[in-house]
Interface confidence: low
């Protein structure tokens, strides 16, 4: 499977909410011995590999924001911890998963990464990620609502397999 990032750039005004999205593409094994682990984190554009560095989102680590579930299930992060930080990550039955950030500030600007680990019990993992940029703007040049820029066809399969 692959991870697609439908949008590579989100430009939002301060105070707005935004939902960053990734999507699982390709054959996804839904057997009973397969579990998916999904999470979000901030990163920087490394020379060798984007998303190799994992930094917290609003002081929540990728461990705090993770989702784990079998192939047939939907999942949400634990509401209390994440919502206190204005965050919620979620996943549906169709391979979409997202993180919603509320009341954006300039400090939220940066590179965001989604990570998916397919765990086959008694076997090794398959790990892929996607990356997208969030720009939070203030002042007269800021848009009134979030503006999203679709990924190019090349970027939309923004994938690094382990």
């Amino acid at each position: 499977f692959k991870v697609a990032t439908p949008y590579s750039l989100y430009v939002c005004p301060e105070g707005q909410n935004v939902t960053l999205t990734c999507r699982l593409l390709g054959p996804v094994d839904k057997g009973h011995d397969v579990t998916f682990y999904k999470t979000w984190y901030r990163s920087s554009r490394g020379e060798v590999q984007t998303c190799s560095e994992r930094r917290p989102i609003r002081n929540l680590t990728f461990q705090d924001l993770h989702l784990h579930h079998g192939g047939h299930q939907a999942a949400n992060t634990s509401h209390d911890l994440a919502q206190r930080h204005g965050l919620e990550s979620a996943s549906d039955h169709h391979g979409n998963f997202s993180i919603t950030m509320r009341n954006l500030t300039l400090l939220d600007s940066g590179l965001y990464c989604c990570l998916v680990v397919e765990i086959r019990h008694h076997h090794s993992e398959h790990r892929v990620h996607g990356a997208m940029e969030l720009q939070v703007q203030t002042g007269k040049d800021a848009p009134s609502n979030c503006v999203v820029y679709p990924s190019s066809s090349q970027d939309s399969e923004n994938i690094t397999a382990a």
Epitope: T39, Q49, S52, Q63, H66, H68, V117, I119, E125, A162
Partner: antibody, heavy 120, light 107 residues
């Protein structure tokens, strides 16, 4: 602060079994993989296998398959490693180590180690 | 299994020296490589993950680089507390394998 505290040193006879425990505190237990890594005297590190408590299924190195059993008790946040049919070359320090997320293999927290001595 | 080969197996250096340890994988592991420091009688400590990312709390004099099969750990200015054994570890596939270690000793 995450801590992994292991059970005490053991002296065992060849052919017997040993069960080492690793109790986690200070963090979520269930969704992190716990691996077991051993180190024979003066030697390097050797991965034996691991488990994600919430999934319950362990993953073992082929070398130890059939001789090692890794389990976890979510209610006590404790992982266990049992090694059977012990031989003298199993004399080593056994470490539990927590992976930094899910079924990943970078070990960010380690137990203090448990020395298992196999001697007749 | 993926074999990990470290060199040198030991080295002598002085405080302030720049030290480089290399690790080679028997097949490509992308950037799925971690570095650990171990002192006698202690558990290993994670220094670098994903080949080049510094683990939280680790001094910036430690750095990692490489991808594919060839990797390097560099200590830019050796400090007294850095005398220890260093291990690389591939995280690409099971069984997880470690290099044989590099012992950094005082010259």
């Amino acid at each position: 602060q995450v801590q992994l505290v292991q059970s005490g040193a053991e002296v065992k006879k060849p052919g017997s079994s040993v069960k080492v425990s690793c109790k986690a505190s200070g963090g979520t237990f269930s969704s992190y993989a716990i691996s077991w890594v051993r180190q024979a005297p003066g030697q390097g590190l050797e991965w034996m296998g691991g488990i994600i408590p919430i999934f319950g299924t362990a993953n073992y190195a082929q070398k130890f398959q059939g001789r090692v059993t890794i389990t976890a008790d979510e209610s006590t946040s404790t992982a266990y490693m049992e090694l059977s049919s012990l031989r003298s070359e199993d004399t080593a320090v056994y470490y539990c180590a927590r992976s930094s997320y899910g079924w990943s293999y970078e070990f960010d927290y380690w137990g203090q180690g448990t020395l298992v001595t196999v001697s007749s | 299994d993926i074999q990990m080969t470290q060199s040198p197996s030991s080295l002598s250096a002085s405080v302030g020296d720049r030290v480089t340890i290399t690790c080679r994988a028997s097949q490509s592991i992308n950037t799925n490589l971690n570095w650990y420091q171990q002192k006698p009688g202690k558990a290993p400590k994670l220094l670098i993950y994903a080949a080049s990312s510094l683990q939280s709390g680790v001094p910036s004099r430690f750095s990692g680089s490489g991808s594919g099969t060839d990797f390097t750990l560099t200590i830019s200015s050796l400090q007294p507390e850095d005398f220890a054994t260093y291990y690389c570890q591939q995280a690409r596939d099971t069984p997880i394998t470690f290099g044989q270690g590099t012992k950094v000793e005082i010259k």
